[in-house]
């Protein structure tokens, strides 16, 4: 039971994650414009991956899209790239998940498979979180740095764009959203690999039975069979459960609190 | 077609208080802010503050901040600005003008003459 | 506060000829975000409200004729009527329109000579 918990609740963590990777790829905010030394103005900017936007104190918003992409700054496309390859892996994850989640009985897929499955998706969960707080851990370094180097007639490197006013950018909403999906998406993929390894039938003990041949006085007593899981022995006798439910000597290990700031 | 229609010209003593209205029509009202200028006679414009309708949000000049209020009305399409403790200084004619792309003045009240004489 | 200065004060010009009145900030009206100029031409004829002519130091609004023409970046503005006409004679005010407090220039009065 408490592996299914384990599983479904990792998979669960691991959407809400990946969702929120791709609702942070696609915002506009990922750059705002620091009204520190002007926060009476009355047109304000905002930059994201794919363009950057003017809302006017009269309310019109206009956005730009990027539309070059050699002229485009070689941090940006990285960032671009590890988010779309964090929501690829992602998206991937999570249809292998589906798979190998306890409550879906598909066939008459065996629990080995599943817990390969599980593994798989755990680690695919871990790696797209990764990319994602690295993307977004990139792009804020670059914000930083392009904030002090920020000056008149200075080129920011976003958008091509050569500036002659003195505007400097901070950290927008969709970092914040970017560093706590990719977050809960590596606690879901971490929660998955757990969930596996209870999943895994490791050792399958078998009752020692006499069989007595005519003639004979032979009794075969087989010792106990190992069914290969793939993921390494494990000499430990543990106690068989039902289902593959968690054995006693593992840990059951809860997604921990992290602050965001 | 979008229109501003003002009060009626006012005179008050110094120390009083006006409040003028601007209803608006053709338009959405509670989409566009809403914004205030002064014009003494001879003399350039001065924007005075703007309003919101929509949430009742407001910005205001420092120069008339604490002096002047401006609200809204949405359900009767009508923009107010009230100035209190009125000086000899505040005889102007004040304008309403809906505020648009640029952060421009794209259409005007005809204007509210406010005389302030003892 | 940004202060806007216009220049000359009063201008008379023959007509059919060319009117240009300018206009100077206290601080740049240059958007890097969308490289545009947050400056508003308006003309006020005697007795009416201002009307708009120009936005974005450069684009006009619909129904304003093509001789009035807007340009420059920056801190420096200029207006440019290409052929005066009668209908013309009015006062010209810019407006900063980038920064809060909105703030007009003290106007240019055009005349015809």
């Known amino acids: 039971m408490a592996v299914t918990a384990c599983q479904g609740l990792g998979f669960v963590v691991s959407l809400i994650g990946i969702a929120g990777i791709i609702a942070a790829t696609c915002m506009d905010q990922w750059s705002t414009q620091d009204l520190y030394n002007n926060p009476v103005t009355a047109v304000f900017n905002y930059q994201g991956l794919w363009r950057s936007c003017v809302r006017e104190s009269s309310g019109f918003t206009e956005c730009r899209g990027y539309f070059t992409l050699l002229g485009l700054p070689a941090m940006l496309q990285a960032v671009r790239a590890l988010m779309i390859v964090g929501i690829v892996l992602g998206a991937i994850g999570l249809l292998v998940s589906i798979f190998a989640l306890k409550c879906i009985r598909i066939g008459s897929m065996e629990d080995s498979a599943k817990a390969n499955m599980t593994l798989t998706s755990g680690i695919m969960f871990i790696v797209s979180g990764l990319c994602a707080i690295a993307g977004v851990s990139v792009f804020a370094n670059m914000l930083v740095t392009n904030f002090w180097m920020s000056t008149a007639n200075m080129y920011t490197g976003m958008g091509g764009m050569v500036q002659t006013v003195q505007t400097r950018y901070t950290f927008g909403a969709a970092l914040f959203v970017g560093w706590v999906a990719g977050g809960l998406t590596l606690i879901g993929g971490v929660m998955m690999c757990i969930a596996c390894r209870g999943l895994a039938p490791e050792e399958t003990n078998y009752k020692a039975v006499s069989y007595h041949a005519s003639g004979h006085s032979v009794a075969y007593k087989p010792g106990g069979f190992k069914a290969s899981t793939g993921f390494g022995s494990n000499t430990k006798n543990k106690k068989i459960y039902d289902g593959g439910a968690r054995t006693e000597d593992e840990v059951q290990s809860y997604p921990s609190k992290h602050d965001y700031v | 077609q979008v229109q501003l229609v003002q009060s009626g010209a006012e005179v008050k003593k110094p120390g009083a208080s006006v409040k003028v209205s601007c209803k608006a029509s053709?338009?959405?009202?509670?989409?566009?802010?809403m914004n205030w200028v002064k014009q003494a006679p001879g003399q350039g414009l001065e924007w005075i503050g703007q309003i919101y309708p929509g949430n009742g949000d407001t910005k205001y000049n420092g120069n008339f901040k604490g002096r002047v209020t401006i609200t809204a009305d949405t359900s009767a399409s009508t923009a107010y600005m009230e100035l209190s403790s009125l000086r000899s200084e505040d005889t102007a004619v004040y304008f309403c003008?809906?505020?648009?792309?640029?952060?421009?003045?794209?259409?005007w009240g005809q204007g509210t003459l406010v005389t302030v004489s003892s | 506060d940004i202060v806007m200065t216009q220049s000359p004060d009063s201008l008379a010009v023959s007509l059919g000829e060319r009117a240009t009145i300018n206009c100077k900030s206290s601080?740049?009206?240059?958007?890097?975000?969308?490289?545009?100029?947050?400056l508003t031409w308006y003309q006020q004829k005697p007795g009416q409200p201002p009307k708009l002519l120009i936005y974005?130091?450069?684009t006009r609004d619909s129904g304003v004729p093509d001789r009035f023409s807007g340009s420059g970046s920056g801190t420096d503005f200029t207006l440019t009527i290409s052929s005066l006409q009668a209908e013309d004679v009015a006062v010209y005010y810019c407006q900063n329109a980038y920064t809060y407090p909105l703030t007009f220039g003290g106007g240019t009065k055009v005349e015809i000579k």
């Open positions: 974005w130091a450069s």
């Open positions: 003008a809906r505020y648009y792309r640029g952060n421009c003045f794209d259409y």
């Open positions: 053709g338009y959405a009202f509670s989409n566009y802010w």
């Open positions: 601080q740049s009206l240059l958007n890097s975000g969308n490289q545009k100029n947050y």
